[in-house]
Interface confidence: medium
C-alpha cells in the first residue's frame, strides 16, 4: 500500500491471541518487551511521546507463537488477559505475561497503522 499525502493516520486496536509453545518445563511466548513505569521512557524507540511509560514489544521471534499470532515489533500492550498494562512496572508486565497457569495469552495492543509506518519511512 503506498502512502497518499493527506490520508488520515490512525492507530488500530487489535486483540492478539498467543498460544504459548511448550518446550520442556517452559512455556514460550516468542517476544520481548520494553518499557514500564520504572523505566526511562526517553529510551523507548517506539513511542512518539517520550513521556510514555507503556509496555512495548521490542522483539518478535521468527516463527514463534507471537509472530504466528500477528504480534508486531512496536505494538503497545494495553491489556494482558483483561489486566491493564498501561501503568505497570517492567517486572509486573513480565510476570503477567509469563504466568504458568495461562497457556493462552490474549493481548490488547495498539499499533501505528500501515499508512503511518509508510509515511515515517518516507520521511526518514
Amino acid at each position: 500500500m503506498s502512502y497518499i499525502p493527506g490520508q488520515p493516520v490512525t492507530a488500530v486496536v487489535q486483540r492478539v491471541e498467543i498460544h504459548k509453545l511448550r518446550q520442556g518445563e517452559n512455556l514460550i511466548l516468542g517476544f520481548s518487551i520494553g518499557g514500564g513505569i520504572d523505566q526511562d521512557p526517553s529510551q523507548n524507540p517506539f513511542s512518539e511521546d517520550k513521556t510514555d511509560k507503556g509496555i512495548y514489544v521490542t522483539r518478535v521471534s521468527e516463527g514463534g507463537p507471537a509472530e504466528i499470532a500477528g504480534l508486531q515489533i512496536g505494538d503497545k500492550i494495553m491489556q494482558v488477559n483483561g489486566w491493564d498494562m498501561t501503568m505497570v512496572t517492567h517486572d509486573q508486565a513480565r510476570k503477567r505475561l509469563t504466568k504458568r497457569s495461562e497457556e493462552v495469552v490474549r493481548l490488547l495492543v495498539t499499533r501505528q497503522s500501515l499508512q503511518k509506518a509508510v509515511q515515517q519511512s518516507m520521511l526518514s
Epitope: V13, R15, G70, N81, G82, R106, R111
Partner: antibody, heavy 123, light 112 residues
Framework: QVQLQQSGAELARPGASVKLSCKAS????????ISWVIQKTGQGLEWIGE????????YYNEKFKAKAALTADKSSSTAHMELRSLTSEDSAVYFC????????????????WGQGTPLTVSS | DVLMTQTPLSLPVSLGDQASISCRSS???????????LEWYLQKPGQSPKLLIH???NRFSGVPDRFSGSGSGTDFTLKISRVEAEDLGVYYC?????????FGGGTKLEIK
C-alpha cells in the same frame, strides 16, 4: 447440539439492576467464550463484551464498561450479565452468543446464539 | 471504532433473483495475523441472528451454497444467487479484526 438458553423477559424500574442469564449445553462450556450483544427496537446489533468461563477473563466494549458486568458459573454452565443503573435507554433485547477465538479454524466469532432476553425499563 | 457501512438499506427482490449486499469498513480489517475477520449474519423476523459466512468467504456449516462472500481490505460483498422465501430478513456484516468488534447497520431483504 449446541444450545444457549436465555432467561425470560424482564421488567425493571429506572435506577435498578437486573441480571440476565444464558445457560449453555451441547458443548464444553469452558472451551469457548460467551459474548453479549444488544439490539434496541428496530435497530442493529452492538457488542457489549465477552467472558471466557475457563479463566473468568472479561473483555468489554468501552461504551458498556460502566453498564454491564459479566460473570460465568462453570458448575452450571451459565453465563450472567448484570446491567446497572438502568434507564429507559437500556430497554432492548439482549442476546448471548458463543464466541470463538481467532485460532478457531471452524465457524465465526458468534457461531451460536441464544433466543434473546427482552428488557423493558419503565417506571 | 471501525464503522461498517452497508448498502442498500433495503433490497426488494423477486424470488429466484440474485441479490447483492455491499459492506464497507472505515479502515482495513486485515488482522495482524493476516486473516480478515469479516462475517455475515442473517436475522429473520422475531429470531436471533445466524452465522452465514466467516473470514470473508467461508460458509458456516449448513449454509446453502447459494450464499457466497467476497472482498478484501475495506470492501466486501454478500451474494445470494437465487433468493428463496426463507432468505428474507435483515443481513448484517461484522468485523472482528479490531477492538471493539462492530456490526454494520443491516440490510433488509424483502419481496418486491
Amino acid at each position: 447440539q449446541v444450545q444457549l438458553q436465555q432467561s425470560g423477559a424482564e421488567l425493571a424500574r429506572p435506577g435498578a439492576s437486573v441480571k440476565l442469564s444464558c445457560k449453555a449445553s451441547g458443548y464444553t462450556f469452558t472451551s469457548s467464550g460467551i459474548s453479549w450483544v444488544i439490539q434496541k427496537t428496530g435497530q442493529g446489533l452492538e457488542w457489549i463484551g465477552e467472558i471466557y468461563p475457563r479463566s473468568g477473563n472479561t473483555y468489554y466494549n468501552e461504551k458498556f464498561k460502566a453498564k454491564a458486568a459479566l460473570t460465568a458459573d462453570k458448575s452450571s454452565s451459565t453465563a450472567h450479565m448484570e446491567l446497572r443503573s438502568l434507564t429507559s435507554e437500556d430497554s432492548a433485547v439482549y442476546f448471548c452468543a458463543r464466541s470463538k477465538t481467532y485460532y478457531s479454524k471452524y465457524g465465526g466469532f458468534f457461531d451460536y446464539w441464544g433466543q434473546g432476553t427482552p428488557l423493558t425499563v419503565s417506571s | 471504532d471501525v464503522l461498517m457501512t452497508q448498502t442498500p438499506l433495503s433490497l426488494p427482490v423477486s424470488l429466484g433473483d440474485q441479490a447483492s449486499i455491499s459492506c464497507r469498513s472505515s479502515q482495513s480489517i486485515v488482522h495482524g495475523n493476516g486473516n480478515t475477520y469479516l462475517e455475515w449474519y442473517l436475522q429473520k423476523p422475531g429470531q436471533s441472528p445466524k452465522l452465514l459466512i466467516h473470514k470473508v468467504s467461508n460458509r458456516f456449516s449448513g449454509v446453502p451454497d447459494r450464499f457466497s462472500g467476497s472482498g478484501s481490505g475495506t470492501d466486501f460483498t454478500l451474494k445470494i444467487s437465487r433468493v428463496e422465501a426463507e432468505d428474507l430478513g435483515v443481513y448484517y456484516c461484522f468485523q472482528g479484526s479490531h477492538v471493539p468488534p462492530t456490526f454494520g447497520g443491516g440490510t433488509k431483504l424483502e419481496i418486491k
